[in-house]
């Protein structure tokens, strides 16, 4: 089976992941989204998603992530803030479609958030220990309960954001890509 | 492979109509926008107006140029795209290029050839 | 509409030598930090070919001396080492809002 490919994100504890899923077709604007977490053995758990059906540009936050779906632009925005150590691991954004099994929308991310203030000269003050100022809409979204296997065991072909090739909607790197933004390398 | 190839264009008098087809193959047709884009002799590149897909209810977008005198639509059956153009006046004389993206508001990845209209009394 | 103004509108380099065209938005075409603005080279009796797609993405099979850059509203375009197939006339383009636009073309010669 083909391993599934990680993109690795290093970032010290109060600082913010900032990542951008893309999943460029018109027929997934209006589905729920979810971020997940992957841990060894285990089914991936969810743990924010948008509404179903996801609103534009709407926020929905679950404790420190916020997720906002930008329908017109296929952008869907993942933001982790105020990390912390024990946030390090697996993560994933998928699109719900049921009955289909849930497509992935990227290559994996391995966050790994270390010890150190975060306040260094060039900081960003999005990424400072301050608590994060979210808008006074955002809402928490009722997450479906069943996750796929084939999120586990079946490996996608790796992602190649955009490229111009002949199209299938089998193939998952045609349906989409991402363009990942950290805060801080 | 990715082809686009525009057909219908011609010589037509001010103030006339004229319909431009763009056959597409080798993608899914009705998952993407379609695209018209014009070039006069010698001048710069303009955006026409676009079609989105069954999901976006077939929404239509023009330039200010040409709204209210063209209309876009497609036929996901024939995996064709259609520029109907009315009330031609000489300044709409150019290629048209058909173009698809590579999804929503993604950029022009694939073009075809162009086919010349002509209005000219 | 977002107007897009290309600097300068014709530009005379020497082979190998680094060519830079700027393309400035009337407003951002940025969407969550992600910028709608790509670059295309045109080159006589052809349509359109796409180099670089939302600022700094190298379009598959485009040469690596080309590169992008830029967000917001302000862009640029570079080659970084002028090869004689690379006269052409370059386009920025905006999609982060409808109507899509282009900017009036930049003509790239050799000196």
């Known amino acids: 089976a083909t391993k599934l490919t990680e993109e690795k994100y290093e970032l010290k504890e109060g600082q913010t992941l900032d990542v951008k899923c893309d999943y460029t077709l018109e027929k997934f604007a209006s589905s729920q989204k979810a971020w997940q977490i992957i841990r060894d053995g285990e089914m991936p758990k969810t743990l924010a998603c948008t509404e179903r059906p996801s609103k534009n540009s709407h926020p929905v936050q679950v404790g420190r992530i916020i997720l906002e779906d930008y329908h017109d632009h296929g952008l869907l925005r993942v933001r982790m803030v105020n990390l912390q150590v024990e946030d390090s691991g697996l993560y994933q954004c998928v699109i719900y479609q049921p009955p289909k099994e849930p497509h992935m929308l990227f290559d994996r991310i391995r966050l790994v958030v270390t010890k150190g203030f975060s306040g260094t000269p060039g900081s960003n003050e999005n990424s400072t220990q301050n608590v994060y100022k979210i808008p006074p809409t955002t809402t928490k979204a009722l997450c479906p309960l069943y996750t796929s296997p084939r999120t586990v065991t079946q490996a996608p072909p790796k992602s190649t954001a955009d490229v111009s090739t002949p199209d299938s909607e089998i193939n998952l790197t045609n349906v989409t890509d991402i363009i990942r933004v950290p805060v801080f390398n | 492979e990715v082809q686009l190839v525009e057909s219908g264009g011609g010589l037509v008098q001010p103030g006339g109509s004229l319909k431009l087809s763009c056959a597409a193959s080798g993608f899914t047709f009705s998952t993407y926008a379609m695209h018209w884009v014009r070039q006069a002799s010698g001048k710069g590149l303009e955006w026409v107006g676009r079609?989105?897909?069954?999901?976006?209810?077939?929404?239509?977008y023009y330039a200010a140029s040409v709204k209210g005198r063209f209309t876009i639509s497609r036929d996901d059956s024939k995996n064709t795209a259609y520029l109907q153009m009315n009330s031609l006046k000489t300044e709409d004389t150019a290629v048209y290029y058909c173009?698809?993206?590579?999804?929503?508001?993604?950029?022009?990845?694939?073009w075809g050839q162009g086919t010349l209209v002509t209005v000219s009394s | 509409d977002i107007v897009l103004t290309q600097s300068p509108d014709s530009l005379a380099v020497s082979l190998g030598e680094r060519a830079t065209i700027n393309c400035r938005a009337s407003e951002s075409v940025d969407t969550a930090d992600y910028s709608f603005l790509h670059w295309y080279q045109q080159k006589p009796g052809q349509p359109p070919k796409l180099l670089i797609y939302?600022?700094?993405n190298l379009e598959s099979g485009v040469p690596d001396r080309f590169s992008g850059s830029g967000s917001g509203t302000d862009f640029t375009l570079t080659i970084s080492s002028l090869q004689a197939e690379d006269v052409a006339v370059y386009y920025c383009q905006q999609s982060n809002e409808d109507p899509y636009t282009f900017g009036q073309g930049t003509k790239l010669e050799i000196k």
């Open positions: 079609i989105r897909t069954k999901s976006s209810n077939y929404a239509t």
């Open positions: 173009t698809r993206d590579m999804g929503i508001r993604r950029q022009f990845a694939y």
């Open positions: 939302r600022a700094s």
